[in-house]
Amino acid sequence: GDLLIQKTIKKQVVLEEGTIAFKNWVKTGTEVYRQFWIFDVQNPQEVMMNSSNIQVKQRGPYTYRVRFLAKENVTQDAEDNTVSFLQPNGAIFEPSLSVGTEADNFTVLNLAVAAASHIYQNQFVQMILNSLINKSKSSMFQVRTLRELLWGYRDPFLSLVPYPVTTTVGLFYPYNNTADGVYKVFNGKDNISKVAIIDTYKGKRNLSYWESHCDMINGTDAASFPPFVEKSQVLQFFSSDICRSIYAVFESDVNLKGIPVYRFVLPSKAFASPVENPDNYCFCTEKIISKNCTSYGVLDISKCKEGRPVYISLPHFLYASPDVSEPIDGLNPNEEEHRTYLDIEPITGFTLQFAKRLQVNLLVKPSEKIQVLKNLKRNYIVPILWLNETGTIGDEKANMFRSQVTGKIN
């Protein structure tokens, strides 16, 4: 019996036309939502003038439906048993699942001012930037709508730069009508234990963002894993959102709509400093902000963002060192709300429920030559927003899963 089930599973999780896995893989049958909470800055003037702690108040959720588009350019390669594809991006606002509209206003860090002052360190260039910032009446903080902040707006300061620069700024700009990839993953035909594992991303086996093993593209994209998952396994996956591979470890058995699943979580160790977790040494890319690589819980992904000083963390700086959150008031991290987990059906390796949580932060530093940053006495890693991307298998699919997979085994 067991061998027959194993054989059936192995056959059905292969990523090729006609299998259950392939159908759900090309276009997810699960509704995926991305909820945003924006950190509204309450004291912009005090911060700018006196270098006070930044007082933030989260506002949300603002919910979008995402990942509803089928994979594109799906191409099988029989020679190396891989399938390549593009994952198109799309987001549809869901008013009924949101606390307000896309036109709601927020006081947030001026993304262009913070980024430009970081990218252009030369003092003379900063003086040029300063005159353009003043001319455009820009400041350290700005008021933007949700739509502008997420999907892009024409920045008045960048619009004055007299040589070609991208004048549109947004945390997720460009998003709609773009695609992530090309991904090339193993289809499992020759070796089921490699199914869904990424072979190359954008034509490469490495990212070129990090040194050593940190630069590797490991595991799957977390939507599924090779079948017959063990609790002792460390599940590796790659997330283009955070420009790195990461891993999850078993936490607990969970019953999801009658289906026994394993809950895997991202452990605090994955966010630790190299002092506590030596494997993380290559995620420490500079010595000043990281206090000689002793800070933890924030990841500098500037190399992946054209030099813009973007730092990724868990929401509310969960698992981050006290020095990171010290200059920010109004944060309340808790594991239940702010950690990432994957609920994996162990026989098939399918992720039937997940919650991916992350926070987007921007570094802003004092600048002698930029008036609006002149009074700052310290560096700030400023939280802009955090997101919760969730998906849960639908009732109908769960019934089908119970009857065709778990029911047959039990």
Epitope: N122, F124, M127, I128, S131, K374
Partner: antibody, heavy 115, light 107 residues
Amino acid sequence: QVQLVQSGAEVKKPGSSVKVSCKASGYRFSDYEMQWVRQAPGQGLEWMGGIDPETGGIAYAQKFQGRVTLTADKSTSTAYMELSSLRSEDTAVYYCTRKLDFDYWGQGTLVTVSS
Amino acid sequence: ETTVTQSPAFMSATTGDKVTISCITSTDIDDDMNWYQQKPGEPPKLLISEGNTLRPGVPSRFSSSGYGTDFTFTINNIESEDAAYYYCLQSDNLPLTFGQGTKLEIK
């Protein structure tokens, strides 16, 4: 050692243009911006503008805006200052000088505007 | 635009004397003031840069002080070779602006 060597003296007619060159050596050219300063006979110093060869960032003094053009050629480590629509008041020694604090100076180029 | 008012325009001193030159700016420029010496037929020479920093190789009899809008340049124990024009320059903001200059004559 750092050296800035400027092109030779020029005599120009009113309404014409002049282009002064400044060849840098002894340091990595694109590491520092090049500033231009002029000094009319018996007068003080006047900042004209500056260029950052690395980014192409340029700033001009309002007085010279539209009449002066600063360029930099990284391949030859040379900065250029072109001043157009010359008038007699433009008769001056033109200096290139490095960085915001003007730490090294060229020897100066005398431009005489006379009909 | 930050205007820089330098005074006096002319001063005369005897070797061994101490002289001071003042530069006052129309806006707060922190300590972004620089001081230059220029002798006839030569380009200016940087003596003191931002933050009242004496340049390497410049004799210690030259010094400066000041922050914000009021700046002072001092030569202690003047020597005959110090006869020259002296200029201040603010490098805090654009456009960069010079003082009008001070001619120092040694009697």
